[in-house]
C-alpha cells in the first residue's frame, strides 16, 4: 500500500514538476527590467527565452521573436536546449510511468517489470529536473553578471550634458517557476526510485518443499520472475500545460489591460 | 468617437479648492489612463500626473503631489481634479488627455480655465 | 527630471516652404527592448487643447497629414514638415515619453512671415 502510494504520489508531483517546466520555458517573464534605484520609465521591458516584450505605461504591450538562431548568445540557445532536453525527458518519463502505476492493469505485466519501468521513469524524472534547474541557474547566473557589469557601466556621458541610462535586468518569475518545477520533478524522480525498490520483488529464502510420489522425486524450487524490459519508448511530446505566460495586458483585453500603476 | 469632455470655467479665491471633471465616452474608460498636463496662460504644458481608473492608483509629478488630487468614477465614466490650497500660481489652464500607444496622449478634453483672484 | 529642449523657439514660414524644429532630451529616449524612441509631437493653435502628431519618435498618428515627418533617435530629434501650409501655424511641443514625469520642451512657435 505505502510502495502504491509513493508511487502514485511521485508521478503526480513529477507531474506538477514538469507542467511548470514547460510553463516556465514558455514564459516571458525570464528576466524584467530592474527598477529599484533607476529612473521610473514609462515602459517596462521583459524578456523570455522566445521574444523580448515591452508593456508601455499606456498599457500596449509589443513582444518580438528572437527570429534569429545564429545570433543569439551561446548560453541562451544551452538554456534552451536544457529546458527542451527536460522536457522531453520529463513526458517520456511520465509516459513510461503511467504504464508502470502498480494501480493500473496491463495485461499480464508483471511486477519486475513495472519495477523496472518505475526506475526508469524516475531516473528520467530527475534528470529532466536537473536539466531544469541548470538551464534556470545558467539563465539566473547570466543576468548576475551583466547586472554587474551595467551597473558598472550604468552612466555613459557624452559630453556631460546627455547620459544613456543602461536598461538593467533582474530576476524574472520564471525563473522561480523553473527553480520550483525543477526541484518537483527531481522530488517526483526520487520517490519513483524509491517506489521502485518496493515493486521489485524479494528473492524470498523458501526450504524447497519435496512432494514425494510414486517413486518420483520432483522439487518444486519458487523462482525469481524473468525481468522483462520491452517497453515501447513512446517519445511522443504529450503537452501538460499549453499555457505560456501571458501577461495579463500582453493582448489589448479589458479591464485587464490596467492592471498595474 | 473618444471625446473628453471638461468641466466649465472655474473663478476661486486664494486658499480654496476646486474640483474639475473630465467625462469620457466613445472608448472603454477603464482601459486607459488618464493624464493631467497644465498650461499657464502664455505658456508651455506641464504634466501633474495620471489616474488608472482600472484600480484608481496614481502617479503624481513631485511638483503636484500635495496640491493635485486625482480619482475617478467608472460608473460615470468620469476623471476628476482636485486642487487645493490655491495661488495665483495656480491660475492656467488644465487639460485631461488619454494615453495610448508610444505613451502618446491621442485624445484631449477642451481644457478647463482655473482663475485664482481675491 | 529629463529637459527637453526645442530649437528654434519660434519660426517665421512662408506657405510652401520647408520646415524643420529640432528637439533635444537630457537622456535617451530610445528603448532597446523594443527598438523605439520615446518622444512624441503634439501641435497647439491658440484656444485649443494639443492635437498629437508624432509618437514613437516617427509615427504619424491617423489623420495626420504626411508632410508632418517625425526623425531622429536617443537624445536627438527633428519635425519636418515639408510643405508649410497656412492651417500649420501653431505652437509644437516635443515630449519625453519614457521617463516620469513626462516633461514638454517650451515649443517652437510657427509664424507667418
Known amino acids: 500500500m505505502a510502495v502504491t502510494a509513493c508511487q502514485g504520489l511521485g508521478f503526480v508531483v513529477s507531474l506538477i514538476g514538469i507542467a511548470g517546466i514547460i510553463a516556465a520555458t514558455c514564459m516571458d517573464q525570464w528576466s524584467t527590467q530592474d527598477l529599484y534605484n533607476n529612473p521610473v520609465t514609462a515602459v517596462f521591458n521583459y524578456q523570455g527565452l522566445w521574444r523580448s516584450c515591452v508593456r508601455e505605461s499606456s498599457g500596449f504591450t509589443e513582444c518580438r521573436g528572437y527570429f534569429t538562431l545564429l545570433g543569439l548568445p551561446a548560453m541562451l540557445q544551452a538554456v534552451r536546449a536544457l529546458m527542451i532536453v527536460g522536457i522531453v525527458l520529463g513526458a517520456i518519463g511520465l509516459l513510461v510511468s503511467i504504464f508502470a502505476l502498480k494501480c493500473i492493469r496491463i495485461g499480464s505485466m508483471e511486477d519486475s517489470a513495472k519495477a523496472n519501468m518505475t526506475l526508469t521513469s524516475g531516473i528520467m524524472f530527475i534528470v529532466s529536473g536537473l536539466c531544469a534547474i541548470a538551464g534556470v541557474s545558467v539563465f539566473a547566473n547570466m543576468l548576475v553578471t551583466n547586472f554587474w557589469m551595467s551597473t558598472a557601466n550604468m552612466y555613459t556621458g557624452m559630453g556631460g550634458m546627455v547620459q544613456t541610462v543602461q536598461t538593467r535586468y533582474t530576476f524574472g518569475a520564471a525563473l522561480f517557476v523553473g527553480w520550483v518545477a525543477g526541484g518537483l520533478t527531481l522530488i517526483g524522480g526520487v520517490m519513483m526510485c524509491i517506489a521502485c525498490r518496493g515493486l521489485a520483488p524479494e528473492e524470498t529464502n523458501y526450504k524447497a518443499v519435496s512432494y514425494h510420489a510414486s517413486g518420483h522425486s520432483v522439487a518444486y524450487k519458487p523462482g525469481g520472475f524473468k525481468a522483462s524490459t520491452g517497453f515501447g519508448s513512446n517519445t511522443k511530446n504529450k503537452k501538460i500545460y499549453d499555457g505560456g505566460a501571458r501577461t495579463e495586458d500582453e493582448v489589448q483585453s479589458y479591464p485587464s489591460k490596467h492592471d498595474y500603476v | 468617437e473618444v471625446q473628453l469632455q471638461q468641466s466649465g470655467p472655474e473663478l476661486v479665491k486664494p486658499g480654496a479648492s476646486v474640483k474639475m471633471s473630465c467625462k469620457s465616452s466613445?472608448?472603454?474608460?477603464?482601459?486607459?489612463?488618464m493624464h493631467w498636463v497644465k498650461q499657464k496662460p502664455g505658456q508651455g504644458l506641464e504634466w501633474i500626473g495620471y489616474i488608472n481608473p482600472y484600480n484608481d492608483g496614481t502617479k503624481y509629478s513631485e511638483k503636484f503631489k500635495g496640491k493635485a488630487t486625482l480619482t475617478s468614477d467608472k460608473s460615470s465614466s468620469t476623471a476628476y481634479m482636485e486642487l487645493s490650497s490655491l495661488t495665483s500660481d495656480d491660475s492656467a489652464v488644465y487639460y485631461c488627455?488619454?494615453?495610448?500607444?508610444?505613451?502618446?496622449?491621442?485624445?484631449w478634453g477642451q481644457g478647463t480655465s482655473v482663475t485664482v483672484s481675491s | 527630471d529629463i529637459v527637453m529642449t526645442q530649437s528654434p523657439s519660434s519660426l517665421t514660414v512662408t506657405a510652401g516652404e520647408k520646415v524643420t524644429m529640432r528637439c533635444r532630451s537630457t537622456?535617451?529616449?530610445?528603448?532597446?527592448?523594443?527598438?523605439?524612441?520615446?518622444l512624441t509631437w503634439y501641435q497647439q493653435k491658440p484656444g485649443q487643447p494639443p492635437k498629437l502628431l508624432i509618437y514613437?519618435?516617427?509615427t504619424r498618428e491617423s489623420g495626420v497629414p504626411d508632410r508632418f515627418t517625425g526623425s531622429g533617435s536617443g537624445t536627438d530629434f527633428t519635425l519636418t514638415i515639408s510643405s508649410v501650409q497656412a492651417e500649420d501655424l501653431a505652437v509644437y511641443y516635443c515630449?519625453?515619453?519614457?521617463?516620469?514625469?513626462?516633461?514638454f520642451g517650451v515649443g517652437t512657435k510657427l509664424e507667418r512671415k
Open positions: 488627455g488619454r494615453l495610448d500607444y508610444g505613451n502618446a496622449m491621442d485624445y
Open positions: 537622456q535617451s529616449l530610445f528603448n532597446s527592448g523594443n527598438q523605439r524612441n520615446y
Open positions: 515630449q519625453n515619453a519614457y521617463y516620469y514625469p513626462l516633461t
Open positions: 514613437w519618435a516617427s
Open positions: 466613445g472608448y472603454t474608460f477603464t482601459g486607459f489612463l
